[in-house]
Amino acid sequence: KKVVLGKKGDTVELTCTASQKKSIQFHWKNSNQIKILGNQGSFLTKGPSKLNDRADSRRSLWDQGNFPLIIKNLKIEDSDTYICEVEDQKEEVQLLVFGLTANSDTHLLQGQSLTLTLESPPGSSPSVQCRSPRGKNIQGGKTLSVSQLELQDSGTWTCTVLQNQKKVEFKIDIVVLAFQKASSIVYKKEGEQVEFSFPLAFTVEKLTGSGELWWQAERASSSKSWITFDLKNKEVSVKRVTQDPKLQMGKKLPLHLTLPQALPQYAGSGNLTLALEAKTGKLHQEVNLVVMRATQLQKNLTCEVWGPTSPKLMLSLKLENKEAKVSKREKAVWVLNPEAGMWQCLLSDSGQVLLESNIKVLPTW
């Protein structure tokens, strides 16, 4: 008996061929001997089966002795043995219909888990293998689970269902809702305008939710809410903002915040959270601000940085086009009695300059 695998919602075409290459009488029946369809001369006739409105054939093939049965919008319960009666012969085809669905929304938050459930006909024993967009393979039976979804899991998952040495392939599009970056760091000189951007790693037709930026300044004992906002169909509206600092927010995506000026008291770490409508859980992005200040007080030239810096970062003071006078893995460096000229304060990581501030030292007479 020939076995054909079908996918729920799809169309399947079961073939039936006569030895005579001409249009002759044929009938398709199910295992209960109920007629599905057949012919009367060159016309299609239908029986009382539950497939009535979903069954069809290709009359253009009848003259060649081919009498296909087409079943549209397949259901799991269409799984059955179908019998084609032609020329006093019976051709049997076993149809097995499978369905594979994500048992929750296909738009999931980063860190959440994905469960895929296989619908299969009674008596079948299929195996399933799914391949994620990043090439990770998972295997299972009726259910497959992936915990802790990552951003790279966004995309098309390809799942192969195997039964009776036949296979059928399903493609499921999964969208992992997350920010493009889990964390970002902004380096600024004191007084400069600061731009924070929070691009999303996904696009959806309508995006609605609410968000907040909490800030922990290095100098402060506790964190405070800097801004709260609403998101409606990708339009941003500010609900509440602190007086100090007076943040400004862009009205369109990507989420964009502007701090009028970088000051040492603002240096620190923030956490932007975004709660999306009809989703449990929140999207998070950490943002860090490092502020540099170079000052000259009497005979002391000082360079300081505030904010979350890694211990491997180097802070240096150097006279332009000369070797560094002082270079330390600390948050403040100074030079006593500096020579006249343009001094540079540099914050660097393995030789790569992250932040630079220039200060002119005038000659003393």
Epitope: S57, R59, S60, I70
Partner: antibody, heavy 119, light 107 residues
Amino acid sequence: EVQLLESGGGLVQPGGSLRLSCAASGFSFSNYAMSWVRQAPGKGLEWVASINEGGSTFYADSVKSRFTISRDNSKNTLYLEMNSLRAEDTAVFYCSRHYGGSYDPMDYWGQGTTVTVSS
Amino acid sequence: DIQMTQSPSSLSASVGDRVTITCRASQDINKYIAWYQQKPGKGPKLLIHYTSTLHPGVPSRFSGSGSGTDYTLTISSLQPEDFATYYCLQYDNPLYTFGQGTKLEIK
């Protein structure tokens, strides 16, 4: 002899409506799927809509929700109701019969009726 | 939706020539391809269906072949009445798509 005769074409303003008819003869109309296919000036053929023997309908994305295909088996006539017409709908509209059902190709075509959408 | 890419878009040939027109589908269409001939101001005429089955009344100089995604219409020896535009049609599913057409002109 299979004959298909389209009518109802003409000049219409953008946003307007038009109803095309196709009178069929020479075959058992109710037993065949029927389609409308159009051809913009100097362009190729574009399938528009189909209706099978049982009345199930299929539409091209470009006309979905604007055009409606229907049939009156007692009058051996196929119809295409066109609403919210656009300049890009300007074309010769052909009525065609399928070899059998909607899973068969079109085997006979009419001579076409011209629809011009312009202000 | 299935896309049909037909080539060439135009072709110059002489009476007696053998010409080939091809159509490539964006996915397997299971041999459900038909070929039509259209002359200016007229409705199309069916030549071939199911890849290679000649429609009644069509001369045997027309033939079709192919499988999977690649299909061909061949005219073995061009006759004066064959100069026209040719289209392929996929009917694997009822959301039909035509190729862009091939205009066959006299050299």
